[in-house]
């Protein structure tokens, strides 16, 4: 296979340091050149790479949304770390946004866990101690259930 470099404009800007790939891969904080001969550093605060790679570009840094606080900034080897503001949380199954934590538990339940950036408050039934799934019945709703049957979904 032959290679022709048609691109003098491909030369990296001075701030992008270069080094040679090791076994075809570039270290964290770099991406590979088109011809595979050079490792080009990611741009601090703009993009990053966390692993040895042969990718043509570094990954774009995450920008924290409003409603999030930045725990640590983006470096060339690590993405920005964002966390939900106090009083809000992000669940694994809905990672796109921070949701407000509930202010209290439904009737007949007690709080056993506080609001954290990763979880809502945790409620359990007073008697059985089983966890509440998070579907909140209206506070004024009356509990009508047969004995031994929880009034709302439990895990």
């Amino acid at each position: 296979i032959t290679q022709q470099d048609l691109a003098p404009q491909q030369r990296a800007a001075p701030q992008q340091k270069r080094s040679s790939p090791s076994e075809g891969l570039c270290p964290p904080g770099h991406h590979i050149s088109e011809d595979g001969r050079d490792c080009i550093s990611c741009k601090y605060g703009q993009d990053y790479s966390t692993h040895w790679n042969d990718l043509l570009f570094c990954l774009r840094c995450t920008r924290c949304d409003s409603g999030e606080v930045e725990l640590s900034p983006c470096t060339t080897t690590r993405n920005t770390v964002c966390q939900c503001e106090e009083g809000t949380f992000r669940e694994e199954d809905s990672p796109e946004m921070c949701r407000k934590c509930r202010t209290g538990c439904p009737r007949g339940m007690v709080k056993v866990g506080d609001c954290t950036p990763w979880s809502d408050i945790e409620c359990v039934h007073k008697e059985s101690g089983t966890k509440h799934s998070g579907e909140v019945p209206a506070v004024e709703e009356t509990v009508t259930s047969s004995p031994g049957t929880p009034a709302s979904p439990c895990s």
Partner: nanobody, 123 residues
Framework: EVQLLESGGGEVQPGGSLRLSCAAS????????MSWFRQAPGKGLEFVSA????????YYAESVKGRFTISRDNAKNTLYLQMSSLRAEDTAVYYC????????????????WGQGTLVTVKP
């Protein structure tokens, strides 16, 4: 979703020419390589040529160097392969493929593939 659509294949006599096209859509990467691979009847996939979108770095297989020319139209997001001095051994299904890896001449470095277009060279 990345989509690649090849066209331009057909039957041609030895010594003749053909121009293949590959229209790409859904490519949102900062840079990528586009390649032509081919598969002759009963044979494995063979790298033909590659071109990179940002810098324009180009690769050719020795078997096609001097006869085939790869090019791209950035505005149309289209890849081309101008094939001339065609030989019987160029008969194959030609596939367009996209990579986000450097120096990519191996099939495993490619994540996106077209359906292929058949080129037949016979007297």
């Amino acid at each position: 979703e990345v989509q690649l659509l090849e066209s331009g294949g057909g039957e041609v006599q030895p010594g003749g020419s053909l121009r293949l096209s590959c229209a790409a859509s859904g490519l949102t990467f900062p840079n990528y390589g586009m390649s032509w691979f081919r598969q002759a009847p009963g044979k494995g996939l063979e790298f033909v040529s590659a071109i990179y979108w940002s810098g324009g770095t180009v690769y050719y297989a020795e078997s096609v160097k001097g006869r085939f020319t790869i090019s791209r139209d950035n505005a149309k997001n289209t890849l081309y392969l101008q094939m001339s001095s065609l030989r019987a051994e160029d008969t194959a299904v030609y596939y367009c493929a996209v990579t986000i890896r450097g120096a990519a001449t191996q099939t495993w470095k490619y994540d996106y593939w077209g359906q292929g277009t058949l080129v037949t060279v016979k007297p």
